[in-house]
């Protein structure tokens, strides 16, 4: 089996260009192509990989939603030479373009990192933006978090940094097959430095310390933060919105995917993508966008632009 | 039917400026890469310069970068290169061509620009 | 110098197949990445004539076919015509230079 091979950090990666094909492992016989795209208040941007997988063929889109940060999640897998470029990976641009100064700021400050490289999303060095309320929605907290793709053998992972509407959530994710977008909430102007190490002790109840008796020399006892997961099963339908339920992560368990897609934990990938040749050096994030008149789901099915004749 | 009408070319002394349009119909504008590609008289293709379809991810041929700028506007279903400091070696006719599946597949008619002094 | 190697001319006579070569290197065709043919007809511009390494846009004859192996690919045209006269471009992308690059050029003169 013959597939086509790319891989997307809010690059142009996977561009018309870029492709390459690659011949897969014995006992492949799935090319896959999995996209996922992140919008904030203040733009989007995708991940993407193209190559040999492994599983049925299928299709899954998925809509999530994490306090106002909304990702669309597409796999498509085939059993043909070269079919995996179906999925339009390429993001809408705005017509016109998105006008962020119609838009009150509601006080809230955040750094924003949409498409960014995790160098340059670092600490204090990414942009800072203003919060505004959109669609009916407060954002008046500031995330710091992951999108995290996996397909053809190969993870891609992005920072994700932005206003959200929840200023406490803690470790919290949403996720699709292969497709997972977490991170932790904060209250304050750019609290969102780096949330990595955020506890889910909230700051205004201060943490319960067990210090150990001051005579004898007993072990230490550690005070132990255990927190619930809420599984959530997939619906049916091949497309939903998805959202988390608590404070702590709500995750899609691997086990309970839609059926027409791989099982993630079940069967590894294999085959792999080859790496994309360099990175966009010269521009920015592909795609990189402001919400104001977006399309809700920009990307969501489509085609590429077909050669003469397609393909 | 898919057209692309390139026009801006002519006569310029080293060291110049100019600027070519490429105007595109026939096909969802905003949703295609573009790119320049000129070619030196009885010589063969270079690439110039692409831009992706939202006009955030620009690349440059090391011969032209710091020089050429490339932009689109997709309201106006317009792809441009402004070409700033001329040099001889850039005389050439310049093509805008449409980025489709992975290839150049619609190419202009194609604009001459004369850098002599 | 180009970065993709083809050979300056090539012939053939009417009803006779002809082959064009094109030589790239682990950082284009060797990288994985697909080749693509252009045609240019005397005083025109390029028209695509194949593209990801073996496909044919429509209107393309099917005299016209590609291949790739390795760091290289071929253009094969069977059953050549007066009208097949032209010059002929290879082109991939390349990861050293950050785009795409094109061969050389072949010049095909169908002779008689």
């Known amino acids: 089996l013959e597939c086509y091979s790319c891989v997307q950090k809010a690059d142009d990666g996977c561009s018309p260009h870029r492709m390459k094909t690659v011949k897969c492992g014995p006992g492949v016989d799935v090319c896959t192509e999995a996209v996922g795209a992140v919008e904030t208040i203040h733009g989007q941007f995708s991940v993407a990989v193209r190559g040999c997988g492994s599983g049925i063929p299928g299709k899954n889109d998925r809509g999530l939603d994490l306090h106002g940060l909304l990702a669309f999640f597409q796999l498509q897998q085939c059993s043909e030479d070269r079919c995996n470029a179906k999925l339009n990976l390429t993001l809408r641009g705005l017509n016109p373009a998105g006008n962020e100064s119609a838009y009150e700021p509601n006080g809230a400050e955040c750094y924003s990192c949409v498409g960014l490289s995790r160098e340059k999303c670092q600490g204090s060095m990414p942009p800072v933006v203003n919060c505004y309320n959109a669609s009916g929605r407060v954002y008046k907290g500031c995330f710091d978090g992951n999108v995290t793709l996996t397909a053809a053998n190969v993870t891609v992972s992005l920072p994700v940094r932005g206003c959200v509407q929840d200023e406490t959530c803690t470790r919290d994710g949403v996720t699709g097959p292969g497709f997972t977008l977490s991170g932790s909430c904060c209250q304050g102007p750019r609290c969102n430095a780096d949330l990595r190490n955020k506890t889910y002790f909230s700051p205004r109840i201060p943490p319960l310390v067990l210090l150990p008796p001051p005579t004898t020399a007993a072990p230490s006892t550690r005070a132990q933060n255990s927190s619930s997961t809420t599984s959530t099963a997939a619906p049916t339908t091949t497309t939903s919105i998805i959202k988390p339920t608590t404070a702590q992560a709500s995750h899609t368990s691997p086990h309970e995917m839609d059926l027409e897609v791989i099982q993630e934990e079940g069967a590894s990938l294999s085959g792999g993508a080859a790496g994309h040749g360099g990175t966009a050096g010269h521009g920015g994030a592909a795609g990189h966008q402001d919400r104001s008149n977006m399309e809700k789901y920009p990307g969501k099915g489509g085609a590429q632009i077909p050669a003469k004749g397609g393909s | 039917e898919v057209q692309l009408l390139e026009s801006g070319g002519g006569l310029v002394q080293p060291g110049g400026s100019l600027r070519l349009s490429c105007a595109a119909s026939?096909?969802?504008?905003?949703?295609?890469?573009m790119s320049w590609v000129r070619q030196a008289p009885g010589k063969g293709l270079e690439w110039v310069s692409y831009i992706s379809s939202s006009g955030s991810t620009i690349y440059y041929a090391d011969s032209v970068k710091g020089r050429f700028t490339i932009s689109r506007d997709n309201s106006k279903n317009t792809l441009y290169l402004q070409m700033n400091s001329l040099r001889a070696e850039d005389t050439a006719v310049y093509y805008c061509?449409?980025?489709?599946?992975?290839?150049?597949?619609?190419w202009g008619q194609g604009t001459l620009v004369t850098v002599t002094s | 110098q180009s970065v993709l190697t083809q050979p300056p001319s090539a012939s053939g006579t009417p009803g006779q197949r002809v082959t064009i070569s094109c030589t790239g290197s682990?950082?284009?065709?060797?990288?994985?990445?697909?080749v693509h043919w252009y045609q240019q007809l005397p005083g025109t511009a390029p028209k695509l004539l194949i593209y990801d390494n073996n496909k044919r846009p429509s209107g393309v004859p099917d005299r016209f076919s590609g291949s790739k192996s390795g760091t290289s690919a071929s253009l094969a045209i069977s059953g050549l015509r007066s009208e097949d006269e032209a010059d002929y471009y290879c082109a991939a992308f390349d990861d050293r230079l950050n785009g795409p690059v094109f061969g050389g050029g072949t010049k095909l003169t169908v002779l008689g």
């Open positions: 061509a449409r980025e489709g599946l992975w290839a150049f597949d619609y």
């Open positions: 026939g096909f969802t504008f905003s949703n295609a890469w």
């Open positions: 682990s950082s284009n065709i060797g990288a994985g990445y697909v």
